[in-house]
């Protein structure tokens, strides 16, 4: 089935994430809360009234309010998760689908430059689908993915800021660049 009503959720590799059930409040009528990882149709965590909570492995934790915590996210945790909540009569009172996408956090971007030909480079080494932005004295100059190369001509002294970001993280570096009139390294 094509998932059209999934809640897109982003998690950072190696970090924990909580999958919170929107507009749900625990009540006495709730008999069963079941979380499934749909790619292999496997039940991964379950709360049942007056029964021991089930966890398929220790990286999962199920809170009393139905929230599922996945600890130390790995790439194979990227999946579509389904939570089903049932009352004492077996009625499916709430069902939510979570499309969990995982990214590696971006590293701090590195700014380097050469005064010989007034060229500046900003580069990010790590991170999934990073977006790089370069600013000169607060003005946006360029947008790229992993590397930005910029030749500046307006002034030999300027403050450059480079930001790297993705869905799960944001890092930035600032470098005041000053070059002598003759253009020496």
């Amino acid at each position: 089935k094509e998932i059209t009503n999934a809640l897109e959720t982003w998690g950072a590799l190696g970090q924990d994430i909580n999958l919170d059930i929107p507009s749900f409040q625990m009540s006495d009528d709730i008999d069963d809360i079941k979380w499934e990882k749909t790619s292999d149709k496997k039940k991964i965590a379950q709360f049942r009234k007056e029964k021991e909570t089930f966890k398929e492995k220790d990286t999962y934790k199920l809170f009393k309010n139905g929230t599922l915590k996945i600890k130390h996210l790995k790439t194979d945790d990227q999946d579509i998760y389904k939570v089903s909540i049932y009352d004492t009569k077996g009625k499916n009172v709430l069902e939510k689908i979570f499309d969990l996408k995982i990214q590696e956090r971006v590293s701090k971007p590195k700014i380097s430059w050469t005064c010989i030909n007034t060229t500046l480079t900003c580069e990010v080494m790590n991170g999934t689908d990073p977006e790089l932005n370069l600013y000169q004295d607060g003005k946006h100059l360029k947008l790229s993915q992993r590397v930005i190369t910029h030749k500046w001509t307006t002034s030999l002294s300027a403050k450059f800021k480079c930001t790297a970001g993705n869905k799960v993280s944001k890092e930035s570096s600032v470098e005041p660049v000053s070059c002598p009139e003759k253009g020496l390294d």
Epitope: K1, N5, D31, D32, K34, E36, T38, K41, K42, K43, K51, F54, K82, S84, Y86, G90, K91, N92, V93, E95, I97
Partner: antibody
């Protein structure tokens, strides 16, 4: 009173298609998970497909890609579209209302599907 | 896939006798096991859910026990209408497989 009534069974040639229906009454149909289960002549029970209250579907490998379960909550009806039918699909097909953990609480009377040339 | 093995395949008993039916799972399924009764020409009927929970409308002579991999359905004193085929079903994980069935016949 909960009632499930299947229809649409019959004789079909190998490779053919058939759509089964299950009319539900006596309960809030849209709020319950539903399944189709089949039983080949003189054999045991085999679960065929599942649809959650919200429309999420699961299939076993034996029918995946050939069978499609769907529901029309406005008509209180469950469907099973069966394509590329094989002789081994010959069975009585039951629709059932299930609980939280696959327990099949209410069953229809079944409809016979015969795949033969 | 969880495989359920029922034994014996056939149980020949007289009315009034006690019937003990076994179901063994290939891996632990906690108490996620359900029992059904099926009579010829009829749809199955849920007898017991979660290994031991009784179902409304089912006579008290039917009881279930077990957890993990070994489960038992007991009929304390067989009535003529109890002669049928009994199936166990895995309710723990996908796919929700059934056992091969035990036929309880009149001796």
């Amino acid at each position: 009173e909960v009632q499930l009534v299947e229809s649409g069974g019959g004789l079909v040639q190998p490779g053919g298609s058939l759509r089964l229906s299950c009319a539900a009454s006596g309960f809030a149909f849209s709020s319950y998970d539903m399944s189709w289960v089949r039983q080949a002549p003189g054999k045991g029970l085999e679960w065929v497909s599942y649809i959650s209250g919200g429309g999420f579907t699961y299939y076993p490998d034996t029918v995946k890609g050939r069978f499609t379960i769907s529901r029309d909550n406005s008509k209180n009806t469950l469907y099973l579209q069966m394509n590329s039918l094989r002789a081994e699909d010959t069975a009585v097909y039951y629709c059932a209302r299930q609980g939280a953990n696959w327990e099949l609480v209410y069953w229809g009377q079944g409809t016979l599907v015969t795949v033969s040339s | 896939e969880i495989v359920l093995t029922q034994s014996p395949a056939t149980l020949s008993l007289s009315p009034g006798e006690r019937a003990t039916l076994s179901c063994r799972a290939s891996q632990s399924i906690s108490d996620f096991l359900h029992w059904y009764q099926q009579k010829p020409g009829q749809a199955p009927r849920l007898l017991i859910k979660y290994a031991s929970q009784s179902i409304s409308g089912i006579p008290a002579r039917f009881s279930g026990s077990g957890s993990g991999t070994d489960f038992t359905l007991t009929i304390s004193s067989l009535e003529p209408e109890d002669f049928a085929v009994y199936y166990c079903q895995n309710g723990h994980n996908f796919p929700p497989t059934f056992g091969g069935g035990t036929k309880v016949e009149i001796k």
